[in-house]
């Protein structure tokens, strides 16, 4: 399956935090999307092979790594001045 | 910042099997990306030999697989290249060679490289 | 085997000149992802080669601004704007879209 954690995370102001994605499902594909709320999914960034990543439409404040197929964090950044949402990881084939 | 280094005989007698061995810095081979072999006969162009990947994995160059074995020594964050049967021909510098972050498979960090003479 | 074809293999050129180096892959380099991982590398004499750019036209830390690259498919070009003294040396293209991983034969910049 796939694994997300931590399920809830506080920030302090002018912090970097991460938040883990594993999937042991051997896809290649996987994605970090942000819910706002009353808002749809918004695609922030996703990475279809190991060590290539492209940035999706929010990207701005974000950072991600893709170092083996099973993982795929996203590191909020002190950037990012409004990070409170839900965020989702997702993987495909 | 990723550092390799190549180490092992310069001098092989063909039909012997040569082996190097890559010692990586600053990064963990088991922390992910892939390790890779390349290497440059005298005056001649790059060939890419294969690699390991982070989870022990191999790919390997059509062309030299039936010779070519790369494995690793987690312990000592190193992986090593052997070749078989060598012949004149196998007369190169040999790299070990690694991807930089978000860049695929393309490789940027290099050892200096080590030349290996194959000679009787 | 995907064959990368550069063009020329050598080339005289001054400093100041815009020098344009081809590459020709023998199958198309776009991946399953969409992404296109053709790459070029400098290389001096005993020196490990240096990465220049990745995925075309993406130009790698540090790499000064008068090299780009561009192209699609299997047709591609390096481009140098303005040579300067350090750009002597040894260009190749290399592709990482189908194993096994290939380079070019090589391009040689020589001064005029």
């Known amino acids: 399956g796939i694994t997300q954690s931590p399920k809830y995370l506080f920030r302090k102001e002018g912090q970097n935090v991460t938040l883990s994605c594993e999937q042991n499902l051997n896809h290649d594909a996987m994605y970090w999307y942000r819910q706002d709320p009353g808002q749809g999914l918004r695609l922030i960034y996703y990475s279809q092979i190991v060590n290539d990543f492209q940035k999706g439409d929010i990207a701005e404040g974000y950072s991600v790594s893709r170092e083996k197929k099973e993982s795929f964090p996203l590191t909020v950044t002190s950037a990012q001045k409004n990070p409170t949402a839900f965020y989702l990881c997702a993987s495909s084939i | 910042q990723v550092q390799l280094q190549e180490s092992g005989p310069g001098l092989v007698k063909p039909s012997e099997t040569l082996s190097l061995t890559c010692t990586v810095s600053?990064?963990?081979?088991?922390?992910?990306?892939?390790w890779n072999w390349i290497r440059q006969p005298p005056g001649k162009g790059l060939e890419w030999i294969g690699y390991?990947?982070?989870?022990?994995?191999?790919n390997y160059n059509p062309s030299l697989k039936s010779r070519v074995t790369i494995s690793r020594d987690t312990s000592k964050n190193q992986f090593s290249l052997k070749l078989s049967s060598v012949t004149a021909a196998d007369t190169a510098v040999y790299y070990c060679?690694?991807?930089?972050?978000?860049?695929?498979?393309?490789?940027?960090?290099w050892g200096q490289g080590t030349l290996v003479t194959v000679s009787s | 085997d995907i064959q990368m074809t550069q063009s020329p293999s050598s080339l005289s050129a001054s400093v100041g000149d815009r020098v344009t180096i081809t590459c020709r892959s023998s199958?198309?380099?776009?991946?399953?992802?969409?992404?296109?991982?053709l790459h070029w590398y400098q290389q001096k004499p005993g020196k490990a080669p240096k990465f220049l750019i990745y995925?075309?036209?993406n130009r790698f830390s540090g790499v000064p601004s008068r090299f780009s690259g561009s192209g699609s498919g299997t047709d591609f070009t390096l481009t140098i704007s303005s040579l300067q003294p350090e750009d002597f040396a040894t260009y190749y293209c290399?592709?990482?879209?189908?194993?096994?991983?290939?380079f070019g034969q090589g391009t040689k910049l020589e001064i005029k």
């Open positions: 060679a690694s991807p930089s972050p978000g860049t695929g498979y393309a490789v940027d960090y």
């Open positions: 390991i990947s982070y989870d022990g994995s191999n």
């Open positions: 600053g990064y963990s081979i088991t922390s992910g990306y892939f």
């Open positions: 995925k075309v036209s």
């Open positions: 199958q198309s380099l776009v991946h399953s992802s969409g992404n296109t991982y």
């Open positions: 290399s592709q990482s879209t189908h194993v096994p991983f290939t």
